[in-house]
Interface confidence: medium
C-alpha cells in the first residue's frame, strides 16, 4: 500500500520530525511576520547588513537613515498588515528603498541600471553587482580610549558602524553569525573598557574576532559560490557528506531533512534575503535541539546556550561517536543484485544513501574526497548499469577509490613535513614560489593574500593527529582557492585559473595541485621601482613587513618565472638583511636609497636579469 | 517491490500479552526507520511506535508508553511490537510502515486486526 492517502496521519506525529521546520501559515505582510519573529533590535541590524552589502559604497549615515525608515514602516504594518504596501515582498520593499539612493548612478556606474528592472530580475542584478573586493581603505584601528570613548558615548552607533564596515567589507558574510560576531564585539568593550589595563584586555579579544571573522566570511563565501555557480544539488551533496560525518549516529532520514531545511538557509542568505534567513536558522536550531537524541550526543552544551551562541556553536560542534559494528558498505553498494535496480529508481537518494554511509563511516577523510568517490561511483555505475553484466563491471568499483583517497594523503605529508622544516612564514613563501609558477598572471596583491592563508594550513592542521589532518588541511584548501576563484572571476587573466574554478568544484585542489609551470607566460619587464623601499617600512607591524616582502618576492617570480629556489633565497636573504641593516641607520631614509640601488643591481646580477 | 508482512493479530483478553511481527523484502531493511501505526474502529489513524535504523532509539505514543516495546532484527529484516498490559482500547487494525527520507512514510503493510476483549 502507498502511503499518499494517509496524509493526515502525518499531522498526529507528535515529534516535529515529520513537519517541515519551515512551513509557516500564509501571512498578509511578510515584513511584519518577520519584524515580529526577529524582534526590532535583530530586524534593524540585519536590514542594515543587508543594505551595506548591496550597496558597499554609500556613507554609514545614509545606509542608518534608510533602515531607519524600513523600520518605521515595518512597525506600521505590525500594527496593521492591511495598511498600504505591507502585502509587498521584502524584495520589493528594500529594492524601492535602495533605488531611492540620490547618488546612485555616480558612486555605482552600471548598478544604477538595476532599478529600471522588476523583481526577481532587479534583485539578482543586485546580488551580480556584489563585489568581493571593493575598493575601500584598510579599517584603521584607533587607540583603545578613542574606542571607549566612542562606545561609551553612543553604544549603538558604535555596534551598528562595526556591522556596517564588515557588512560593507564582506558583501556574503553570513548575516545570522555576524549578529553573534557583534555581540562578542560589544562583550569585549563592556569588559574591556572597565579594566584597568584597557589594551591588553581588548586588543587581543580584537584581534581574535578580526581572524575568526576572516575565517567565517571566507567559509560563508564557498557554499554560496556553490550555490549559485553549481547549484543546489553541489551543495545538498556537500552538506550530505559534511553533517554526515559530524551526525553519524543519525539515521539517513534525518540527515537528509537537516540537509534540506540548511540548503534553504544558506540559498535564502546567499540571495540576500537575510530576515528569512535568520528566521529559518533560528527554527533549524530550535529543531536540532528539540531532537538531539535522534541527531547527536555532542548537542546538549549548545543548546542550552542563546540563540545566537546556540545556532554557532551547533555549526561548530565536534563530530559525534560513530556507531559500533558498522556493516560493510560493500554489501549494499557493490555485493548487492539490487544496485542498479536501487540507482534507477532513485538516482540522488541512492547516491545520497552511498554518500551519507561513507562519510559517517569516514570522519578521517576530507568533505571534498567524500564527494569525488561518490562521483567516482556514480560515474561507474551509470557505465556499469547499462552494461551486459552490471554487476561485473562495477564489481572493483570501490578499488578505484585508493588513488583518489592516497593522493590527499601524499600531499598532506609531503606539505606538513615542508611546514614542519620551514616554519610558517617559509611555507608561504615556497607557496608564494609555487603559485606565482603556476598562474604568473594573477595580480600580485591576490598571490600574496592566497599564498599567505594557504600557507596557514601548516600551523592550522599539521599539529591535527593523522585521524584530523586530512579533513582539516583539504576542506580549508578549498575555502581559500576559492578566495581565488571570486577574486580571479572579477578581472579574469588567466585561463588556467579559470578552468581550475570553473570545472570541478571538488577538484579545484587537485586541478591546482597539478599544475606545472606556465611555459607560456612572458616575464615581466624589469621595473625597480617595484623594489624601492622607504624607511617607512621599519614602523611596520611585522605582518605588515611580511607582506611587503612577500609582495617583492611575487614580483621577483614575474620577472624571473625560470630563478631556482637557490637563487631567490639568496635574494630574499639579501633583502631582509638590507632591511634590517637600514632600520637600524640613523638616517634611515638615505640608507634606503643608497643601499637599495645596491641591492637591486645585485638581485638582478644573481637572477641574471 | 516493496513488501510488509504482518501476520500474528488475533484475540486477546484483557491484561494479557501479544508480540506482532512484521517481515520486510524489496528494500534495505537497515537503513530505514521502522514503525506501527493503528486504527481503531470508527477512529483516525494514531502513530505507536517507531524505532530508528540502528535500533537505538525509539518513540511511543504515550497511550502506549511502558506497555508496548519496538524492536527490530536487521539479520531477519523483521520488526516487532511486543504489546502487554494490553486494554479494550487497544483494539485496532495494526500496520506495519517503512519511513522515506522526510520522515513520513511511504509503505505500509495489509494490517492485522487485535481485538482485546473478554
Known amino acids: 500500500m502507498k502511503w499518499v492517502t494517509f496524509i493526515s496521519l502525518l499531522f498526529l506525529f507528535s515529534s516535529a520530525y515529520s513537519r517541515g521546520v519551515f512551513r509557516r501559515d500564509a501571512h498578509k505582510s511578510e515584513v511584519a511576520h518577520r519584524f515580529k519573529d526577529l524582534g526590532e533590535e535583530n530586524f534593524k541590524a540585519l536590514v542594515l547588513i543587508a543594505f551595506a552589502q548591496y550597496l558597499q559604497q554609500c556613507p554609514f549615515e545614509d545606509h542608518v537613515k534608510l533602515v531607519n525608515e524600513v523600520t518605521e514602516f515595518a512597525k506600521t504594518c505590525v500594527a496593521d498588515e492591511s495598511a498600504e504596501n505591507c502585502d509587498k515582498s521584502l524584495h520589493t520593499l528594500f529594492g524601492d528603498k535602495l533605488c531611492t539612493v540620490a547618488t546612485l548612478r555616480e558612486t555605482y556606474g552600471e548598478m544604477a541600471d538595476c532599478c529600471a528592472k522588476q523583481e526577481p530580475e532587479r534583485n539578482e542584478c543586485f546580488l551580480q553587482h556584489k563585489d568581493d573586493n571593493p575598493n575601500l581603505p584598510r579599517l584603521v584601528r584607533p587607540e583603545v580610549d578613542v574606542m571607549c570613548t566612542a562606545f561609551h558615548d553612543n553604544e549603538e552607533t558604535f555596534l551598528k558602524k562595526y556591522l556596517y564596515e564588515i557588512a560593507r567589507r564582506h558583501p556574503y558574510f553570513y548575516a545570522p553569525e555576524l549578529l553573534f560576531f557583534a555581540k562578542r564585539y560589544k562583550a569585549a568593550f563592556t569588559e574591556c573598557c572597565q579594566a584597568a589595563d584597557k589594551a591588553a584586555c581588548l586588543l587581543p579579544k580584537l584581534d581574535e574576532l578580526r581572524d575568526e571573522g576572516k575565517a567565517s566570511s571566507a567559509k560563508q563565501r564557498l557554499k554560496c559560490a556553490s550555490l549559485q555557480k553549481f547549484g543546489e544539488r553541489a551543495f545538498k551533496a556537500w552538506a550530505v557528506a559534511r553533517l554526515s560525518q559530524r551526525f553519524p549516529k543519525a539515521e539517513f532520514a534525518e540527515v537528509s531533512k537537516l540537509v534540506t531545511d540548511l540548503t534553504k538557509v544558506h540559498t535564502e542568505c546567499c540571495h540576500g534575503d537575510l530576515l528569512e534567513c535568520a528566521d529559518d536558522r533560528a527554527d533549524l536550531a530550535k529543531y536540532i535541539c528539540e531532537n538531539q537524541d535522534s541527531i547527536s550526543s555532542k548537542l546538549k552544551e549548545c543548546c542550552e546556550k542563546p540563540l545566537l551562541e546556540k545556532s554557532h556553536c551547533i555549526a561548530e560542534v565536534e563530530n559525534d561517536e560513530m556507531p559500533a559494528d558498522l556493516p560493510s558498505l560493500a554489501a549494499d553498494f557493490v555485493e548487492s543484485k539490487d544496485v542498479c535496480k536501487n540507482y534507477a529508481e532513485a538516482k540522488d537518494v541512492f547516491l545520497g544513501m552511498f554518500l551519507y554511509e561513507y562519510a559517517r563511516r569516514h570522519p578521517d577523510y576530507s568533505v571534498v574526497l567524500l564527494l569525488r568517490l561518490a562521483k567516482t561511483y556514480e560515474t561507474t555505475l551509470e557505465k556499469c548499469c547499462a552494461a551486459a553484466d552490471p554487476h561485473e563491471c562495477y564489481a572493483k568499483v570501490f578499488d578505484e577509490f585508493k588513488p583518489l583517497v592516497e593522493e590527499p594523503q601524499n600531499l598532506i605529508k609531503q606539505n606538513c613535513e615542508l611546514f614542519e622544516q620551514l616554519g610558517e612564514y617559509k611555507f608561504q613563501n615556497a607557496l608564494l614560489v609555487r603559485y606565482t609558477k603556476k598562474v604568473p598572471q594573477v595580480s600580485t596583491p591576490t598571490l600574496v593574500e592566497v599564498s599567505r592563508n594557504l600557507g596557514k594550513v601548516g600551523s592550522k592542521c599539521c599539529k591535527h593527529p593523522e585521524a584530523k589532518r586530512m579533513p582539516c588541511a583539504e576542506d580549508y584548501l578549498s575555502v581559500v582557492l576559492n578566495q581565488l576563484c571570486v577574486l580571479h572571476e572579477k578581472t579574469p587573466v588567466s585561463d588556467r585559473v579559470t578552468k581550475c574554478c570553473t570545472e570541478s568544484l571538488v577538484n579545484r585542489r587537485p586541478c591546482f595541485s597539478a599544475l606545472e609551470v606556465d611555459e607560456t607566460y612572458v616575464p615581466k619587464e624589469f621595473n625597480a621601482e617595484t623594489f624601492t623601499f622607504h624607511a617607512d617600512i621599519c614602523t611596520l607591524s611585522e605582518k605588515e613587513r611580511q607582506i611587503k616582502k612577500q609582495t617583492a618576492l611575487v614580483e621577483l617570480v614575474k620577472h624571473k618565472p625560470k630563478a631556482t629556489k637557490e637563487q631567490l633565497k639568496a635574494v630574499m636573504d639579501d633583502f631582509a638583511a638590507f632591511v634590517e641593516k637600514c632600520c637600524k641607520a640613523d638616517d634611515k631614509e638615505t640608507c634606503f636609497a643608497e643601499e637599495g640601488k645596491k641591492l637591486v643591481a645585485a638581485s638582478q646580477a644573481a637572477l641574471g636579469l | 517491490e516493496v513488501q510488509l508482512l504482518e501476520p500474528g493479530g488475533g484475540l486477546v483478553q484483557p491484561g494479557g500479552s501479544l508480540r506482532l511481527s512484521c517481515t520486510a523484502s524489496?528494500?534495505?531493511?537497515?537503513?530505514?526507520?521502522m514503525g506501527w501505526v493503528r486504527q481503531a474502529p470508527g477512529k483516525g489513524l494514531e502513530w505507536v511506535s517507531w524505532?530508528?535504523?540502528?535500533?537505538?532509539?525509539?518513540y511511543y505514543a504515550d497511550s502506549v508508553k511502558g506497555r508496548f516495546t519496538i524492536s527490530r532484527d536487521n539479520s531477519k529484516n523483521t520488526l516487532y511490537l511486543q504489546m502487554n498490559s494490553l486494554r479494550a482500547e487497544d483494539t485496532a487494525v495494526y500496520y506495519c510502515?517503512?519511513?522515506?527520507?522526510?520522515?513520513?512514510?511511504?509503505?505500509w503493510g495489509q494490517g492485522t486486526l487485535v481485538t482485546v476483549s473478554s
Open positions: 524489496g528494500f534495505t531493511f537497515r537503513h530505514y526507520r
Open positions: 524505532i530508528r535504523p540502528d535500533g537505538t532509539f525509539t
Open positions: 510502515a517503512k519511513s522515506y527520507l522526510s520522515g513520513t512514510f511511504d509503505y
